[in-house]
């Protein structure tokens, strides 16, 4: 092809060439043609002869103001076409009259601003239609009954005032899964235009200036459709009351978006008449007081989202919004309540009473005064099935015994990015039976006793990360009742001491966080007492993490029980020798990270069975002695291995001797090394 | 399931040593801290200490920290306790036991070895 | 360390009559404390940990409870085999303090 197109698989890309013509030299039995964002005028039917096989055709972001009606002549297969982000203006009866086997067609952003006629009348296949960002001032796409098979009506983005009967009944056969009408001026709605669609599922009128007024008429002219889904975001809907939605009564809707509405004022059993809702979002509001009614009704409703829904009006403690005792429990089905991001002054002894299906709360930054948890905190929550508490980003300081002692179904905890500063004595956790869970990283420091777990033997995954970490050093060992942990994250904590009994029993562990800590004294021989073999019993270990330790030496043995090792990190530490053999036991090593040492000889000896299996290696940045004995069987290794070693031309550099000083180590020349022979497999 | 075995009485005289034994079994020794418990007739429990028979490192009561040394060796699955310069006070059941799952607890006790301090 | 007291030292009571043993701890134990059971010439048994958690095969008529560094043990129904010696102990760090014990006989 003298184009510049690629094609695989039957499937040509020719964007983004600047073509001002269709190529002619493709091969013949592409079924997928690209020609998006290039500068083609037209699209002349003789050239698609040779493309008969296509099925999609892509022409966005061009400067086509016209289409030959033959086009789709040459194209009997085609059923998905696009024309997005072009010039057409007029659409007459003759332009898509060979295209029969459409499913999509997209035409959105052009400059289409009347349909006259029937253009589509012969789309019986068409399943979505967009024609959004264009300039139409109504919703009359035809004169006659048509488009029966379509299910998604894209309008959004254009000047369409009134949703009128006698445009909307060209789709007296179709059901409509979406109609999509946002970002229009809708004032009206006359009576009976969405009864003259066969069925409508979805609606969507999202940025549509409504308000209460218009809300409560649009759901009068619903009553009695098949609308399931419907959506009114951004439509400046500042309240609710018993009537607004009055008109759904009639209906099954199951889906209700009122998401950056600034709603203000949710008045009381606003939504009894929605018992079949089952998916509610109502995130990014403005409501200053939740009633005990105001959710009334809602006996469905599985997915609540409340983020952002109440926010302070000023600085002043008597504008923080409040959510009245019992407001929740109508919501009998509710599986899953996000309520981030809110300014709620704190939990009240009934606030989350009634919820008995609750699975997943999130809590993150939802409250301005949330200090401590005490066993009374969540004693609402106690007849809810909770499995996942996210209590993020509280400014939480302090944990109470029984704190979490009506969660007993609670799997997952997470407390990170508060402020907790306390000792843990493990009554912290009393009740959490079932609990795989507890992410305490990012808080303010926790000094742990040998009890600080002991209640919760179940917990498979700890993560505390940052936490100034005190007694870790405590023997027994603060870990020793966790023997479920597969994971443990310890890192960043400027640790120091650890006995060698630390993670005894923990043989189920995968995946052991150390990075940024100060462990290094423990590997030296000179240690009193010798190397701190801390990492003994790990028999299931996949990943090990030691970066930013410090660590000058390794002890041969260190890895040795590590026999399901899959990636090690040692990056930036001042590693410069590796005894012989520290990764002879290191059979299932994928990922080998040593980047940022002091590292001048890569042997054979040492590295040789690190390497047998390595998917990963990183070993940029290290002084490399760029002599035989040091490195010539590395660099015959790398030239020959498949094993990705990113940046390899550019950070993996020869620091000595003096004349190869920045030299790529990859170039170094070996054919005058005696005994440089890669290792054989 | 796990047992604790222990030899059911001693007889020693004053100012000498004795060493009792505490044989476990049913699970894997050296994932389970021993600890060591002292009962005079007709009288209370007393904890002694209690040792990682992992790694032999030991936490004793300071009560007991000259009169007991405790020891394992790992090859037999058997913990021991010295006790030395045996006077009537030493006179009493030894019993060896072990936390269970949940670590704030004895569910599993040696049935106990009765030493007499007599001459 | 922490101290132990428990009281009272002896009980006289009655098959079918209901019975309370306290210990109290001189420092806060934080809910780590076990409840035994023992017979003439044998082993303790564990009865109740963690204050208040029943150990596996304890009949339902024991029960634990704790306010403050105060923590019972109640017995309802006495039953023939119920008599013997009754010992608490702390769990909060060492050494693991137990009680003098409770004698409680049959009437």
């Known amino acids: 092809s003298t184009t510049k197109c690629t094609v695989s698989h039957e499937v040509a890309d020719c964007s983004h060439l600047k073509l001002t013509q269709v190529p002619d030299d493709l091969p013949t039995n592409i079924t997928v043609l690209n020609l998006t964002h290039n500068q083609l005028r037209r699209l002349p039917a003789a050239n698609f002869t040779r493309y008969s096989q296509l099925t999609s055709l892509d022409v966005g972001f061009n400067t086509i103001s016209k289409l030959e009606p033959e086009l789709c002549q040459k194209l009997p297969m085609l059923k998905v076409l696009n024309l997005q982000h072009n010039e057409l203006s007029q659409l007459s009866d003759k332009t898509f009259a060979f295209c029969t086997n459409l499913t999509e067609l997209h035409l959105m952003s052009n400059s289409i601003q009347k349909i006259k006629n029937n253009p589509f009348v012969k789309q019986k296949n068409l399943i979505t239609l967009d024609l959004s960002h264009n300039g139409l001032s109504s919703t009359k796409l035809g004169t006659q009954v048509q488009l029966e098979n379509l299910q998604e009506l894209l309008l959004s983005n254009n000047k369409i005032q009134a949703l009128k009967s006698e445009e909307l009944d060209i789709f007296a056969n179709s059901s409509l899964k979406k109609l999509e009408l946002s970002s229009n001026q809708i004032k009206e709605f006359s009576p009976g235009c969405f009864h003259a669609i066969g069925r409508l599922f979805g609606l969507f009128l999202n940025n549509v200036q409504l308000g209460p007024s218009l809300t409560e008429k649009l759901c009068l002219e619903l009553a009695n459709t098949s609308i399931r889904n419907l959506s009114l975001s951004n439509s400046q809907l500042s309240t609710t009351s018993n009537t607004t939605f009055l008109g759904l009564k009639w209906t099954n809707l199951t889906m209700l978006d009122l998401s950056y509405n600034n709603l203000n004022v949710v008045g009381n059993d606003s939504f009894a008449w929605l018992p079949q809702l089952e998916y509610f979002f109502l995130e990014y509001n403005n409501i200053q007081h939740l009633f005990s009614h105001s959710l009334h009704g809602l006996f469905n409703v599985r997915y609540l989202n409340l983020k952002r829904s109440f926010t302070k009006q000023s600085i002043s403690l008597a504008s923080l919004p409040k959510i009245d005792d019992f407001s929740f429990q109508w919501l009998k089905c509710l599986e899953h309540l996000n309520m981030e991001d809110n300014d709620i002054p704190g939990i009240k002894s009934n606030m989350f009473t009634g919820l008995i299906n609750l699975k997943y709360l999130s809590l993150s930054n939802s409250f301005t005064s949330l200090r401590t948890l005490t066993n009374e905190t969540f004693v609402s929550l106690a007849h809810s099935p909770l499995h996942i508490l996210n209590l993020t980003k509280n400014k939480i300081s302090k944990i109470e015994s029984d704190a979490f002692s009506w969660l007993g179904h609670l799997e997952v905890l997470d407390l990170g990015l508060n402020e907790i500063g306390q000792e843990l004595t493990g009554q912290e956790w009393r009740g959490l039976e079932n609990i795989f869970e507890i992410y305490l990283s990012y808080n303010k420091y926790l000094q742990l006793t040998r009890n600080s777990f002991a209640l919760v033997p179940s917990l498979q995954r700890l993560m505390l990360r940052r936490v100034a970490l005190k007694n870790v050093d405590s023997s027994p060992s603060p870990f020793q009742p966790l023997r479920n942990l597969t994971i443990l994250d310890l890192s960043n904590n400027n640790i120091a001491n650890i006995n060698d009994d630390m993670l005894e029993g923990l043989e189920k562990l995968e995946i052991l966080d150390l990075q940024h800590n100060n462990l290094a004294r423990l590997w030296k021989h000179a240690n009193p007492g010798g190397p701190i073999y801390f990492l003994k019993g790990l028999s299931h270990l996949h990943i090990l993490n030691l970066e930013s330790n410090g660590f000058d030496e390794i002890p041969v043995e260190v890895f040795k029980d590590l026999f399901e090792l899959k990636i090690i990190d040692l990056g930036l530490n001042n590693l410069n020798t590796l005894p012989a053999s520290v990764f002879n036991n290191q059979v299932s090593l994928k990922s080998l990270n040593l980047q940022k040492n002091l590292i001048t000889s890569v042997e054979k000896k040492v590295f040789g069975p690190a390497f047998r299996n390595l998917t990963e290696l990183d070993m940029r940045f290290n002084p490399f002695d760029c002599t035989c004995e040091s490195i010539a069987w590395f660099v015959n290794w790398i030239n020959e291995t498949h094993t990705n070693i990113p940046e390899l031309s550019s950070h993996y550099l020869c620091n000595t001797p003096p004349h190869y000083h920045g030299f790529p180590v990859r170039l170094f020349d070996t054919s005058s090394c005696k005994d440089s022979a890669p290792f054989e497999l | 399931q796990v047992q604790l075995q222990q030899p059911g009485a001693e007889l020693v005289q004053p100012g000498t040593s004795v060493r009792l034994s505490c044989k476990a079994s049913?699970?894997?020794?050296?994932?389970?801290?021993i600890h060591w418990v002292k009962q005079r007739p007709g009288q209370g429990l007393e904890w002694i200490g209690e040792?990682?028979?992992?790694?032999?490192?030991?936490n004793y009561n300071e009560k007991f920290k000259t009169k007991a040394t405790l020891t394992v060796d790992k090859s037999s699955s058997t913990a021991y306790m010295q006790l030395s310069s045996l006077t009537s006070e030493d006179s009493a059941v030894y019993y060896c036991?072990?936390?269970?799952?949940?670590?704030?607890?004895?569910?599993?006790w040696g049935q106990g070895t009765l030493v007499t301090v007599s001459a | 360390d922490i101290q132990m007291t428990q009281s009272p030292a002896s009980l006289s009571a009655s098959v079918g009559e209901t019975v309370t043993i306290t210990c109290r701890a001189s420092?806060?134990?934080?809910?780590?404390l076990a409840w035994y059971q023992q017979k003439q010439g044998k082993s303790p048994q564990l009865l109740v940990y963690?204050?208040?958690t029943l150990a596996d095969g304890v009949p339902s008529r024991f029960s634990g409870s704790e306010s403050g560094t105060q923590y019972s043990l109640k017995i309802n129904s006495l039953q023939p085999e119920d008599f013997g010696s009754y010992y608490c102990q702390h769990f909060w760090s060492t050494p693991f303090t137990f009680g003098s014990g409770t004698k409680l006989e049959l009437k």
């Open positions: 420092g806060n134990i934080h809910n780590y």
């Open positions: 040792i990682n028979p992992n790694n032999g490192r030991i």
């Open positions: 963690n204050a208040k």
């Open positions: 036991t072990r936390v269970g799952v949940m670590i704030t607890t004895f569910p599993y």
């Open positions: 049913g699970y894997i020794f050296t994932t389970y801290w």
